[in-house]
């Protein structure tokens, strides 16, 4: 891996600057895709922050980014203005570049924040140069809130700062009024004032009357050393604007603003709902707006103007529908900080909020809602309902558009057809069965997030309270006893105070469930069973005839039983008993009670006359260890010879 580029970034104070390929450019000898060249921020900036243009600019600090994102101009450094003035400040970012299998490369990015740089975002090089508003024929103080060169002083090391000042030399005087310092007028012979005089409130502008035309003065500001000596250091030449206001002027009144809602990457007109003022003195064309700070999610443009952003527009532009917001790819909400003026009153701050709507949202359903059988209810979670768009939507709201058929949704214990993502996340939204005739249910919701909706179906299944055997393979051709070691709903019986019932829904593919006669006196052989109870299991009355797969040589195979389990006061549940079978092996100890073994095996043992045991299973029934497990086929013979 190699790292090129200047590794220096120059940023205007209080502004946002993208990292570029001139600043930071990584490459690899293998020609790696820029998407795979990953930077990790080891130490973030101290004077600002690093963020991604298309992610939440108010969220957590950026931790990782790729070279591809640098190329796209999506990695931004934002300088945060400090409270104390400065002339130049330095920041650093420590990064680690990685792209396995290459070795990581450490890099430092130096950031210079300087008033020296030419900044389109702020035309003045001074800490403040905001201009002045004065009523016609009157006078007003020019304070440090309007004009402040403290940042020039900040370029001097602090021990010597007290001995320095800033000298403002007026190069062009006001044409419609006078500048006074300590009540003495400035003129060609005395064209100077100092930062210290400005700080002491000694600088005044007095308007001469006779109209409300604009006024102002031009100046050059530079450092002055001890005893008035000129010293080398930062300097600037600028103009200070003075606006004269009609004394009868009524200032414009901003009206309440509705946020603009727009899908990302699209364009929408700004209307009076977003920007309007009440001003009886001014025509819409006289009410001017200036963008002081723009968000990162798009820009304002004028129809018929250039393609780029506009920073000045009028109420007439808004009223005629000429002003539009153009959203970029960002999904983040943002705010325009504007100043509005009718040209005769001091500017008023206004804001225009822009909410970026997702072009679409999706309800993520990661799993059906599983309801424990004995409980009959379960809380919804993000596993069942979560809305995502271009970001997660924690503010999502849900409305039932089709309720469940066998139960209801409750919020805080009462039936509810509407709820929020927050209520889901806090476990307050519960589905409860009210009709215990189905093992599954579903409901349909409409999700609403940031003005966009989507529907989804949540499936509900009941998880059987059933302990199912999970041992080794069972012998093909044998009949094994189906008892609580294999299927046990005893806990469900205890929880419901009822005898659970089983209904055979499907399987086994090779074999059948049979009722085993209790004694020789009972008529007939084994009866096919489709329903049975927990009591039948406990009584040892059931057998599973394990068949052989047809049409092929005996070999191990898998099989299953699908059952529906019912009990009083709870929903039914579907469960399956999955088992493996293999050709009977007389030498193998099977871990289940066998009621009979395959015919061929009996022939070999000299018992051709007995095909199915019809009497009591003998010691097997009460033996804690299945007889076959005691010693293979000989154990089976020993246990069954008297039957």
């Amino acid at each position: 891996l190699s790292l090129e580029g200047s590794r220096t970034l120059t940023v205007c104070p209080g502004s946002v600057q993208p990292l570029s390929s001139q600043t930071l450019r990584a490459s690899s000898s293998a020609g790696t895709d820029p998407q795979l060249l990953l930077y990790r921020v080891v130490r973030g900036p101290q004077l600002g922050r690093l963020f991604h243009a298309q992610q939440d600019s108010t969220g957590e600090a950026l931790v990782n980014f790729t070279q591809a994102e640098v190329y796209a101009g999506n990695i931004l450094y934002e300088h945060e203005m400090p409270t104390e003035p400065f002339w130049e400040a330095h920041d650093t970012l420590e990064l680690q570049l990685s792209s396995p299998p290459a070795r990581d490369v450490a890099a430092t990015l130096a950031v210079a924040v300087s008033f020296e740089a030419a900044c389109p975002q702020r035309p003045s090089h001074l800490w403040k140069n905001k201009g002045l508003w004065v009523p016609e024929g009157q006078r007003a103080k020019i304070t440090m809130a309007a004009l402040d060169a403290s940042n020039l002083l900040a370029s001097v090391p602090s021990p010597q700062r007290l001995e320095h000042d800033v000298l403002f030399q007026v190069t062009q005087f006001p044409s419609r009024g006078q500048l006074l310092v300590s009540e003495e007028p400035l003129h060609a012979g005395q064209p100077h004032f100092l930062q210290s005089q400005l700080a002491a409130g000694q600088l005044v502008y007095a308007h001469g009357g006779g109209g409300t035309q604009q006024d102002g003065f031009h100046f050059r500001a530079h450092l002055q050393g001890p005893a008035g000596a000129t010293v080398a250091g930062p300097q600037t030449s600028e103009a200070f604007a003075i606006t004269v206001r009609d004394v009868n002027e009524r200032p414009p009144q901003p009206q309440a603003s509705v946020p603009l809602r727009i899908t990302r990457g699209s364009r929408a007109p700004i209307s009076r709902a977003q920007l309007s003022v009440v001003d009886p003195d001014s025509a819409p064309g006289e009410i001017e707006y200036e963008v002081q700070r723009a968000p990162h999610n798009g820009f304002l443009s004028l129809v018929g103007g250039g393609p780029g952003p506009v920073t000045h527009f009028t109420q007439a532009d808004v009223d005629s529908g000429r002003l539009a917001f153009v959203a970029n790819g960002s999904s983040v909400a943002g705010v325009f900080q504007l100043s509005m003026s009718d040209g005769a009153s001091p500017p008023l701050p206004m804001s225009l909020a822009v909410d970026i709507l997702p072009s679409a949202i999706e309800v993520q359903l990661q799993a059906p809602l599983e309801v424990p059988q004995a409980l009959g209810r379960s809380s919804l979670s993000q596993q069942q309902l979560r809305v995502v768009s271009d970001r997660e939507e924690p503010e999502a709201a849900y409305r039932l558009i089709q309720g469940p058929k066998y139960g209801h949704l409750l919020v805080g214990g009462r039936p509810a057809s509407a709820f929020s993502q927050l209520q889901i996340d806090q476990g307050e939204v519960v589905f409860a069965f009210t009709n215990f005739s189905s093992s599954h249910d579903h409901f349909r919701v409409l999700a609403l997030a940031r003005g966009v909706n989507a529907s989804a179906v949540v499936n509900i299944t009941v998880r059987a309270l059933l302990h199912v055997w999970a041992g080794g393979p069972w012998p093909q051709g044998a009949t094994l006893r189906l008892d609580p070691t294999i299927l046990d709903a005893g806990e469900l019986a205890n929880r419901t105070g009822s005898v659970p019932h089983f209904r055979l829904l499907e399987g086994p593919r090779h074999g059948r469930v049979v009722r085993v006669p209790r004694a020789r006196t009972e008529p007939g052989g084994s009866q096919l069973v489709e329903q049975f109870t927990q009591q039948d299991l406990e009584d040892g009355r059931l057998g599973l005839e394990v068949g052989r797969p047809e049409g092929r040589a005996p070999s191990p195979t898998g099989d299953s039983l699908t059952l529906e389990l019912w009990a009083q006061g709870v929903p039914p549940a579907v469960a399956s008993l999955d088992f493996a079978t293999e050709p009977y092996n007389a030498a193998r100890p099977y871990s289940v009670a066998l009621l009979s073994v395959p015919e061929a095996t009996r022939m070999e043992a000299g018992k051709p006359e007995s095909s199915t045991p019809t009497g009591e299973p003998g010691p097997m029934a009460s033996s804690p260890v299945p007889a076959v497990a005691k010693g293979g086929f000989l154990g089976f013979l020993e246990a069954n010879m008297f039957s």
Epitope: G376, I401, G403, G413, R414, P415
Partner: antibody, heavy 112, light 107 residues
């Protein structure tokens, strides 16, 4: 808050169909979950008849199921009860309710 | 159907008394139980839902507790306006069913 108001004839002849309507104000019948009909025989306890839900599905008390129909008219924000083949045993005060709030009830007498 | 049995069927009490009414379900209904108050000639009013949650506007002297099959409505200090008939109702399993009522009379 939601308010409910029952309306319908107070006297119904035996074997005929009892019809009542509940008008909901202060809320929509497509947002509240259950819209129930409940009755109370004179001097007796409460008996749930059935409900219609926000999405129009129904459930009825098995003891009355064969004779009951509950329907709704979302445009009028109303839901209705029809009980067919009535007898004197159906004489009762009939309430509509969403359980949180109840109508004031209307007495229906079944008599020829 | 789930049977709801209230006890006592009626009770006499004085203003300021602590009154307890019980409701028993024929099988478990979790916490899905409402309590209502009904005065003569009036519709029932919901007091408590979900066993112990107080409905809006209901005085805090009313409280509910229980789970499964046994539930209790308690009036901590009986007021003159509390003389009425009280019903419990389960909403755990269809059909919804009510208790037969407990009449609270002035002693």
């Amino acid at each position: 808050q939601v308010q409910l108001q029952e309306s319908g004839p107070g006297l119904v002849k035996p074997s005929q169909t009892l019809s009542l309507t509940c008008t909901v104000s202060g809320g929509s019948i497509t947002s509240g979950y259950y819209w129930n009909w409940i009755r109370q025989h004179p001097g007796k306890g409460l008996e749930w008849i059935g409900y219609i839900t926000f999405d129009g599905s129904n459930n009825y008390n098995p003891s009355l199921k064969s004779r009951v129909t509950i329907s709704r008219d979302t445009s009028k924000n109303q839901f209705s009860l029809k009980l067919s083949s009535v007898t004197a045993a159906d004489t009762a005060v009939y309430y509509c309710a969403d359980f949180d709030y109840w109508g004031q009830g209307t007495l229906v007498t079944v008599s020829s | 159907d789930i049977q709801m049995t209230q006890s006592p069927s009626s009770l006499s009490a004085s203003v300021g008394d602590r009154v307890t009414i019980t409701c028993r379900a024929s099988r478990g209904i979790r916490e899905y139980l409402n309590w209502y108050q009904q005065k003569p000639g009036k519709a029932p009013k919901l007091l408590i839902y979900y066993t112990g949650s107080l409905h809006s506007g209901v005085p805090s002297r009313f409280s509910g507790s229980g789970s499964g099959t046994d539930f209790t409505l308690t009036i901590s200090s009986l007021q003159p306006e509390d003389f009425a008939t009280y019903y419990c109702q389960q909403y755990s399993e269809l059909p919804w069913t009510f208790g037969q009522g407990t009449k609270v009379e002035i002693k």
